[in-house]
């Protein structure tokens, strides 16, 4: 009897109520592998989710996020609100990056500006909420009289060292 079930292809299930013959998956269900005793219910893309790929008898539906949200987790298990560049998402919603940090994307968290001095370089272009600093030649490489653009000492964040 076990062998009968193993013959059931994807898109069908082994129906115990009908002498273990292979029955097609009912509407809104699927089986992606052969030999299944039941079909799985199709995922429904509702609310902040939208359908990227319809469910078929052999594969589950695939969801995306509606405009203004982006996918998180395996197989887009969650939709997270987009923020603007220069912001990050918190429980309160989208919040501007703290001084000394930036985010050049609509998702993710604010990261610190690059520490140019780690590579013996100086800051050529100051960082902003949306953009990292641009590092230039080391101070020693600058011609006499030239000065590097150095961001002001941080005022709002404890102990940030953007340089």
């Amino acid at each position: 009897l076990q062998d009968l079930c193993s013959n059931c292809p994807a898109g069908t299930f082994c129906d115990n109520n009908r002498s273990q013959i292979c029955s097609p998956c009912p509407p809104n269900s699927f089986s992606s592998a052969g030999g299944q005793r039941t079909c799985d219910i199709c995922r429904q893309c509702k609310g902040v989710f939208k359908t990227r790929k319809e469910c078929s008898s052999t594969s589950n539906a695939e969801c995306d996020c509606i405009s203004g949200y982006h996918c998180l987790g395996a197989e887009c298990s969650m939709c997270e609100q987009d923020c603007k560049q220069g912001q990050e998402l918190t429980k309160k919603g989208c919040k501007d990056c703290c001084f000394g940090t930036f985010n050049d994307q609509k998702r993710g968290i604010c990261r610190p500006w690059t520490n140019c001095s780690l590579d013996g370089k100086s800051v050529l272009v100051n960082g902003t909420k949306e953009r990292d600093v641009v590092c230039g030649p080391s101070p020693a490489d600058l011609s006499p009289g030239a000065s590097s653009a150095t961001p002001p000492a941080p005022a709002r964040e404890p102990g940030h060292s953007p340089q």
Epitope: L72, E80, E88, L89, T90, K91, K92, K95, C98, G100, T101, G108, I109, C110, R111, P112, W113, T114, N115, L118, D132, R156, E157, P158, G159, H160, S161, P162
Partner: antibody, heavy 121, light 111 residues
Framework: EVQLVQSGAEVKKPGSSVKVSCKAS????????IYWVRQAPGQGLEWIGN????????FYGEKFMGRATFTADTSTSTAYMELSSLRSEDTAVYYC??????????????WGQGTLVTVSS | SVELTQPPSVSVSPGQTARITCKLN????????VHWYQQKPGQAPVTMIY?????PDGIPERFSGSSDSSSNSAFLTISGVQAEDEADYYC??????????FGGGTKLTVL
């Protein structure tokens, strides 16, 4: 499997420095903040500061400004915390912890096992 | 600046329900994610609850998180307390999105 493995216990003299390492594995080291937190004997958790290994950007708690230095070696996926001018009050277990790239006010999902630093003359 | 206040100790009999409070001194608790860690002697903290009420994989359902705006507090509730739950519990939030703030910790004693 994500892991943060810290260096072993240290005994230091007052006025000296200590450098604790935190080796990360199982994830992209450059894409997550590493936070440093300490715990004095019988006391609570205290934030020291944090580093973004992707570019070496750092933040320090006011109490540790000028004494703590964070670095990261991306070739070995290892973060370091150096604390100088040690005093007896710095005796504590020092932890590194990872913060997910989900929101700006997120939790620490993985912690190192801790490094006991004892400062004694 | 943000401060989180916890009772130093909570005692409960096995099988009873323990509730640990984390009170926010300023601002609105509804605006802050609160996370909870369990720490046993000689061990690193372990996340029990994150983002107010979410449980990581492997954490028993008897651990739950909630908050109450009228008392401006977050709560860690442990139902059907077991001897193995005896530990220190810390709440965690942020003063800014860079600066974490921890409660002072609560020692849970199982009688």
């Amino acid at each position: 499997e994500v892991q943060l493995v810290q260096s072993g216990a240290e005994v230091k003299k007052p006025g000296s420095s200590v450098k604790v390492s935190c080796k990360a594995s199982g994830y992209t080291f450059t894409s997550y903040y590493i936070y440093w937190v300490r715990q004095a004997p019988g006391q609570g958790l205290e934030w020291i500061g944090n580093i973004w290994p992707g570019n070496g950007g750092t933040f320090y708690g006011e109490k540790f400004m000028g004494r703590a230095t964070f670095t990261a070696d991306t070739s070995t996926s290892t973060a370091y915390m150096e604390l100088s001018s040690l005093r007896s009050e710095d005796t504590a277990v020092y932890y590194c912890a990872r913060r997910p790239d989900y929101s700006g006010d997120d939790y620490f999902d993985y912690w190192g096992q801790g490094t006991l630093v004892t400062v004694s003359s | 600046s943000v401060e989180l206040t916890q009772p130093p100790s909570v005692s409960v009999s096995p099988g009873q329900t323990a509730r640990i409070t984390c009170k926010l001194n300023s601002g609105n608790i509804g605006s802050y994610y609160v996370h909870w860690y369990q720490q046993k002697p000689g061990q690193a903290p372990v996340t029990m609850i994150y983002r107010d009420d979410k449980r990581p994989d492997g954490i028993p359902e008897r651990f739950s998180g909630s908050s109450d705006s009228s008392s401006n507090s977050a709560f860690l509730t442990i139902s059907g307390v077991q001897a193995e739950d005896e530990a220190d519990y810390y709440c965690h939030s942020y003063d800014s999105t860079i600066t974490p703030v921890f409660g002072g910790g609560t020692k849970l004693t199982v009688l």
